[in-house]
């Protein structure tokens, strides 16, 4: 029961986190104009990963997309990449975790397979959350660097003519959404990994039965008909109780899912 709860809660927390990562990635307010020097501006600037916007006090808002790839700063491209990788991994993780949920029965899927899938989705959520946190942190660092550079320019007269008030940018709402969402996804992933341990079947008598029984032992094997259908496991290459309960095939193929992260 506790395992089901942990798994279910991990799924829900990750779902909320990934929704937040998607929202943060799409939001325009990654950086907002710092109003410290000009709190009575009639024009308010803010920028996202995909476009920059200007809101006039009249109520009119104009947004312009960044219609160039090569002209954009490498850091911005990196942040975009991190957020997209986070979303993709999170989405795949969600898909995998749906089938891994203990409360959902799909055919006669073994607990070991569910444990495998739970662990896989958990790791995906963890990496997804880390990608989001990394992306947001890189952007925040970029903002802090630019903020102090423009502040230095302001007070040393480097900003061109004397009358020019340089526009400085500070943290936008999307950064906080991204940090929280990344954290939630990470927590959800950890919960899924914890749930995975509880899902893996413990040493039970039926294992011994499957080895000591006569030729008709197939009837006692967990998974029933699957043994002869090619769907399920072949006992000679299945390590049923190997930690996370992965097949050898899965153990080999698993890292390749993350080769391009």
């Amino acid at each position: 029961m506790a395992v089901t709860a942990c798994q279910g809660l991990g799924f829900v927390v990750s779902l909320i986190g990934i929704a937040g990562i998607i929202a943060a990635t799409c939001m325009d307010q990654w950086s907002t104009q710092d109003l410290y020097n000009n709190p009575v501006t009639a024009v308010f600037n803010y920028q996202g990963l995909w476009r920059s916007c200007v809101r006039e006090s009249s109520g009119f808002t104009e947004c312009r997309g960044y219609f160039t790839l090569l002209g954009l700063p490498a850091m911005l491209q990196a942040v975009r990449a991190l957020m997209i990788v986070g979303i993709v991994l999170g989405a795949i993780g969600l898909l995998v975790s749906i089938f891994a949920l203990k409360c959902i029965r799909i055919g006669s899927m073994e607990d070991s397979a569910k444990a495998n899938m739970t662990l896989t989705s958990g790791i995906m959520f963890i990496v997804s959350g880390l990608c989001a946190i990394a992306g947001v942190s890189v952007f925040a660092n970029m903002l802090v660097t630019n903020f102090w550079m423009s502040t230095a320019n302001m007070y040393t007269g480097m900003g061109g003519m004397v009358q020019t008030v340089q526009t400085r940018y500070t943290f936008g709402a999307a950064l906080f959404v991204g940090w929280v969402a990344g954290g939630l996804t990470l927590i959800g992933g950890v919960m899924m990994c914890i749930a995975c341990r509880g899902l893996a079947p413990e040493e039970t008598n039926y294992k011994a039965v499957s080895y000591h029984a006569s030729g008709h032992s197939v009837a006692y094997k967990p998974g029933g008909f699957k043994a002869s259908t090619g769907f399920g496991s072949n006992t000679k290459n299945k390590k049923i109780y190997d930690g996370g309960a992965r097949t050898e095939d899965e153990v080999q193929s698993y890292p390749s899912k993350h080769d391009y992260v």
Partner: antibody, heavy 119, light 113 residues
Framework: EVQLVESGGGLVQPGGSLRLSCAAS????????MHWVRQAPGKGLEWVAY????????YYADTVKGRFTLSRDNPKNSLYLQMNSLRAEDTAVYYC????????????WGQGTTVTVSS | DVVLTQSPDSLAVSLGERATINCKSS????????????LTWYQQKPGQTPKLLIY???TRKSGVPDRFSGSGSGTDFTLTISSLQAEDVAVYYC?????????FGGGTKVEIK
């Protein structure tokens, strides 16, 4: 058709008070910021105050700060300017205008209401 | 506060001739975010309310004759009437719409010579 109609002007003694109103029609009043601009006889335009669509931001010219209070009633499509401690230099035609256009430009103006401060 | 200085105070131009009005700002009105200058030009004919001519320093409002044009960036702006018509006799004002208070220039009176 956008219409702005000012009212409430008149003759008042120095130190007195007056409340100007601006009735708006022909546009979604609650979506736009509103301004008051005045023009003293034979003089140029002087911006007086601004209120944002939801009354979240209100700004005043230094010459009227602390004496004038700007407010709006969106359900009634009305804008108000409460003028206290009036001085002779506040004598002017008061226009209400809206930043209905791009670039914070004041596109629509009322016909104005005259305020005369004199003893 | 942004101070706008208009010059000249008055201008007499022959019909069909070019009229040029200058507006100088004490601070830059250029917004980096959208690369636009937040300066507006108005026309006020005798006994009438002001009328919007140009916003964003150079964008003509729809319905305004194309003989009116705005130019300039940062702190120096110009309103040009390429061929003065009798109906253009008015006072012209520039306005800072970049930061509050939204100050006006002193106005330039355009007359026919």
């Amino acid at each position: 058709e956008v219409q702005l109609v000012e009212s409430g002007g008149g003759l008042v003694q120095p130190g007195g008070s007056l409340r100007l109103s601006c009735a708006a029609s022909g546009f979604t009043f609650s979506s736009f910021g509103m301004h008051w601009v005045r023009q003293a006889p034979g003089k140029g335009l002087e911006w007086v105050a601004y209120i944002s669509s939801g009354s979240g931001s209100i700004y005043y010219a230094d010459t009227v700060k602390g004496r004038f209070t700007l407010s709006r009633d969106n359900p009634k499509n009305s804008l108000y300017l409460q003028m206290n401690s009036l001085r002779a230099e506040d004598t002017a035609v008061y226009y209400c205008a809206t930043s209905y256009y791009y670039g914070n430009a004041l596109e629509y103006w009322g016909q104005g209401t005259t305020v005369t401060v004199s003893s | 506060d942004v101070v706008l200085t208009q010059s000249p105070d008055s201008l007499a131009v022959s019909l069909g001739e070019r009229a040029t009005i200058n507006c100088k700002s004490s601070q830059s009105l250029f917004n980096v975010g959208n690369q636009k200058n937040y300066l507006t030009w108005y026309q006020q004919k005798p006994g009438q309310t002001p009328k919007l001519l140009i916003y964003w320093a150079s964008t003509r409002k729809s319905g305004v004759p194309d003989r009116f044009s705005g130019s300039g960036s940062g702190t120096d702006f110009t309103l040009t009437i390429s061929s003065l018509q009798a109906e253009d006799v008015a006072v012209y004002y520039c306005q800072n719409v970049y930061s509050y208070p939204l100050t006006f220039g002193g106005g330039t009176k355009v007359e026919i010579k």
